[in-house]
Amino acid sequence: LVPHLGDREKRDSVCPQGKYIHPQNNSICCTKCHKGTYLYNDCPGPGQDTDCRECESGSFTASENHLRHCLSCSKCRKEMGQVEISSCTVDRDTVCGCRKNQYRHYWSENLFQCFNCSLCLNGTVHLSCQEKQNTVCTCHAGFFLRENECVSCSNCKKSLECTKLCLPQIENVKGTEDSGTT
């Protein structure tokens, strides 16, 4: 099955690469606007220039286009802990990221929040913190991993997963409790 092409894609495919079909006259192919510019007026005829204008401050186009308006620059989400890595220019959107020793957690495809990398206290770093993934920790004996932090086995309740990792400690606690009864 051939995927359906949208109207714009259909119109563009008639013209060679870097050109688009005139919306009012499908016998004319106009040159697309360069990145950093947008379409102000279509070319008046074959071989004539398309009227492209530079994007205004606060807007951009990142590729050749025949958009009637530039795209608005993204704003980094301070409430998500994001910082600006590079400012928006006429041909590139704002680049947002996280501070040093932080990683991104994605809530949706385009929305991320910055979190501090785990330090693996009472454990060792198994995998270093990455741009999109927290540090992976391995805990020392007597500690178990909970929400990527090494927690003392004294905080391990019988009902929790940690019982396997903290078995000797659990037995000791049980033994102490039992020895108290006479």
Epitope: W107, S108, Q113, F115, E147
Partner: nanobody, 120 residues
Framework: EVQLLESGGGLVQPGGSLRLSCAAS????????MGWVRQAPGKGLEWVSF????????YYADSVKGRFTISRDNSKNTLYLQMNSLRAEDTAVYYC?????????????WGQGTLVTVSS
């Protein structure tokens, strides 16, 4: 069929507390990030809080930080929002949503919402 059923709303005095619940069915709850979104009378939708699939990551809007706590019980397929120190400006219909559907019209894909009214 995905179903999200919010409950726990009601009338409460300023400074009071409420606990909202959202019972989920029709999808693998423990695989999805979930969130609470609210709509005050005559206003747009506002993100309130998010939680990841295993409860390790949470997000709170500045307006509720320190007062609201999001949690989930994957064994019960339920999402919670503990709301303390409630203010008049917290008055809204609260919806729970699976985060993939955040951009979708709430009345189409979300629950019916639960109304929280903070008034003396």
């Amino acid at each position: 069929e995905v179903q999200l059923l919010e409950s726990g709303g009601g009338l409460v005095q300023p400074g009071g507390s409420l606990r909202l619940s959202c019972a989920a069915s029709g999808f693998t709850f423990d695989k999805y990030q979930m969130g609470w979104v609210r709509q005050a009378p005559g206003k747009g939708l506002e993100w309130v809080s998010f939680i990841d699939s295993n409860g390790h990551h949470t997000y709170y809007a500045d307006s509720v930080k320190g007062r609201f706590t999001i949690s989930r019980d994957n064994s019960k397929n339920t999402l919670y929002l503990q709301m303390n120190s409630l203010r008049a400006e917290d008055t809204a219909v609260y919806y729970c949503a699976e985060l993939d559907n955040l951009s979708i019209t709430p009345f189409d894909y979300w629950g019916q919402g639960t109304l929280v009214t903070v008034s003396s």
